[in-house]
């Protein structure tokens, strides 16, 4: 859901030619296309193994998608003079497996960063903060797109992937100005407890297509600006009272809960009551039970308390298969 960049027929992209001359400030790098009129550079599907050094100073939109960058070192975009205008950086699908601390330093106008579809075995805690100080200089980032960055199982570090991503999001409190965070399709089993507390400006949070089972330890309380919360296609079984109250207390939020395996037993009663009265959940009439078997495909909004029972736990001597 990142904002679009565009080329125009009135400003055709200029394919660059390799040159033996020293790079000029506004020369187009080899294997890239440049439009000064659109302030855009596209180095797309060119199997680049490193970020071009001779990016033009006018660049505001930089597409480095579909390459083979492998590693983004510290200062990967640091130039002298700096790329002071770079606002939108798209690195999706460039086979990055390592983003080191300070990779995005010296980009004072970087508002939107897309690292999606890179199998990030290592994301430094200081990738976005740039320093290991307990409180860093604020990052200019407003939109951070990290969809499908989970590495294959054999490339995972010993520590949890969720923890690694969380550490990068909270380091130095650098992302206090972040408005949009996309973390879809990352096999997240849980959301580390303190992440959202460090992202108070969030307006849009996408956690769809993960494996979240519960939100019990997640607090949304301080996300007073939150407008959209995407939780579709997870493994949520029920939302408990604490979560329901927090969501109801957010003034602008719309919550998306489709395609979760809701368990319609006695623990679901509070959520059903809440769903019937809330305007927060979009498409709430589409939510259906997945378990137990006798309740499958029942619409949550149509349930009443008599439908929501829990089988009594039998003593072991009376249990049967």
């Amino acid at each position: 859901t990142s904002s679009a960049s565009s080329s125009s027929s009135s400003a055709p992209f200029l394919a660059s030619a390799a040159s033996a001359q020293p790079p000029l400030p506004d020369q187009c790098p080899a294997l890239c296309e440049c439009s000064e009129a659109a302030r855009t550079v596209k180095c797309v599907n060119r199997n680049l193994t490193e970020v071009p050094t001779d990016l033009p100073l006018y660049v505001r939109n930089l597409f480095l998608t579909g390459n083979q960058l492998a590693v983004l070192p510290a200062g990967a975009f640091a130039r002298r003079p700096p790329l002071a205008e770079l606002a939108a950086l798209n690195l999706s699908g460039s086979r990055l497996d390592e983003v080191r601390g300070g990779a995005f330093e010296h980009l004072p106008s970087l508002r939107q960063l897309d690292l999606s579809h890179n199998p990030l075995a290592y994301l430094s805690p200081f990738a976005f903060s740039g320093s290991n100080a307990s409180i860093s200089a604020p990052s200019p980032l407003v939109e951070l797109i990290l969809n499908h960055i989970v590495p294959p199982d054999d490339k995972r570090q010993n520590r949890s992937f969720e923890g690694m991503v969380a550490a990068a999001l909270v380091a130095g409190r650098a992302l206090q100005g972040l408005h949009l965070l996309e973390l879809a399709s990352n096999h997240f089993l849980y959301l580390p407890r303190d992440v959202l507390a460090q992202l108070p400006s969030l307006r849009y949070l996408d956690l769809s297509n993960n494996s979240l089972v519960s939100l019990t330890y997640v607090s949304f309380r301080n996300l007073t600006h939150l407008e959209s919360l995407h939780l579709e296609d997870n493994a949520l079984k029920v939302l408990h009272n604490g979560t329901l109250a927090e969501l109801q207390g957010l003034p602008h939020v719309r919550v998306f809960l489709d395609n979760n395996p809701w368990v319609c037993d006695c623990h679901m009663a509070d959520m059903v009551t809440w769903l019937k009265q809330t305007g927060v959940v979009q498409g709430k009439d589409r939510l259906t039970c997945a378990f137990p078997e006798k309740m499958r495909n029942r619409v949550l909004l149509e349930l009443n308390s008599a439908d929501l029972d829990c089988d009594p736990i039998l003593p072991p001597s009376l249990q049967t298969s």
Epitope: T1, S2, S3, A4, S5, S6, S7, S8, S9, A38, R39, T40, Y58, R60, N61, A84, E85, A87, A88, P108, S109, R111, Q112, V142, E143, H179, L180, R203, Y204
Partner: antibody
Framework: EVQLLESGGGLVQPGGSLRLSCAAS????????MSWVRQAPGKCLEWVSA????????YYADSVKGRFTISRDNSKNTLYLQMNSLRAEDTAVYYC??????????????WGQGTLVTVSS | DIQMTQSPSSLSASVGDRVTITCRAS??????LNWYQQKPGKAPKLLIY???SLQSGVPSRFSGSGSGTDFTLTISSLQPEDSATYYC?????????FGCGTKLEIK
């Protein structure tokens, strides 16, 4: 030639709803972020809302958040603004405009001629 | 949100004069600033983008400068058709905002 043509304006009572449309032609619509800007009679320009080329990202001024919804149909080359819970202070000429470049880096290079929305009882 | 303050709110000048309009942002916006011209009953028209780049088809007497928080639109030799209201706009913030305009009249 790039053209943007707004429609759907008119007189509506406070609390009512209206949907504005902006028909675009002369360019690859889905490649451009688009915006709505309004101007109350005799007043300044006010940026209202914007949407990315794909329609995936939307942005709203605080004054309309929760009441207005921007959307687009790229197959029809049309931009929309659904306006609910209208107030007298929403009375304005509404312009649609094309962003050139990415949302954070851009400028509005083409504008429609505007459609007047009047909210009054 | 980022606030944009224009000055003066109105001015009157003679044909051939050099005219300067200023715009100040409430925080640094690098060079993410655009200038538009609007004539009565018409849609705005882009003059300057990225603080200093002249939009295609705009006369060269218009120029823009500045970076950070302070920006200037200059008309080097005022012409009768330049009578209009001029707006600055920032596109650095999450939400884009306009200044409240400078109304320019020809004496």
């Amino acid at each position: 030639e790039v053209q943007l043509l707004e429609s759907g304006g008119g007189l509506v009572q406070p609390g009512g709803s209206l949907r504005l449309s902006c028909a675009a032609s002369g360019f690859t619509f889905s490649s451009y972020a688009m915006s709505w800007v309004r101007q109350a009679p005799g007043k300044c320009l006010e940026w209202v809302s914007a949407i990315s080329g794909s329609g995936g990202s939307t942005y709203y001024a605080d004054s309309v958040k929760g009441r207005f919804t921007i959307s687009r149909d790229n197959s029809k080359n049309t931009l929309y603004l659904q306006m609910n819970s209208l107030r007298a202070e929403d009375t304005a000429v509404y312009y649609c405009a094309r962003y050139y470049g990415g949302y954070y880096s851009a400028w509005m290079d083409y504008w429609g001629q505007g459609t007047l929305v009047t909210v009054s009882s | 949100d980022i606030q944009m303050t224009q000055s003066p709110s109105s001015l009157s000048a003679s044909v051939g004069d050099r005219v300067t309009i200023t715009c100040r942002a409430s925080q640094s916006i690098s060079s993410f600033l655009n200038w538009y011209q609007q004539k009565p009953g018409k849609a705005p028209k882009l003059l300057i983008y990225a603080a200093s780049s002249l939009q295609s088809g705009v006369p060269s007497r218009f120029s823009g400068s500045g970076s950070g928080t302070d920006f200037t639109l200059t008309i080097s030799s005022l012409q009768p058709e330049d009578s209009a209201t001029y707006y600055c706009q920032q596109t650095y913030g999450y939400l884009h905002t306009f200044g409240c305009g400078t109304k320019l009249e020809i004496k």
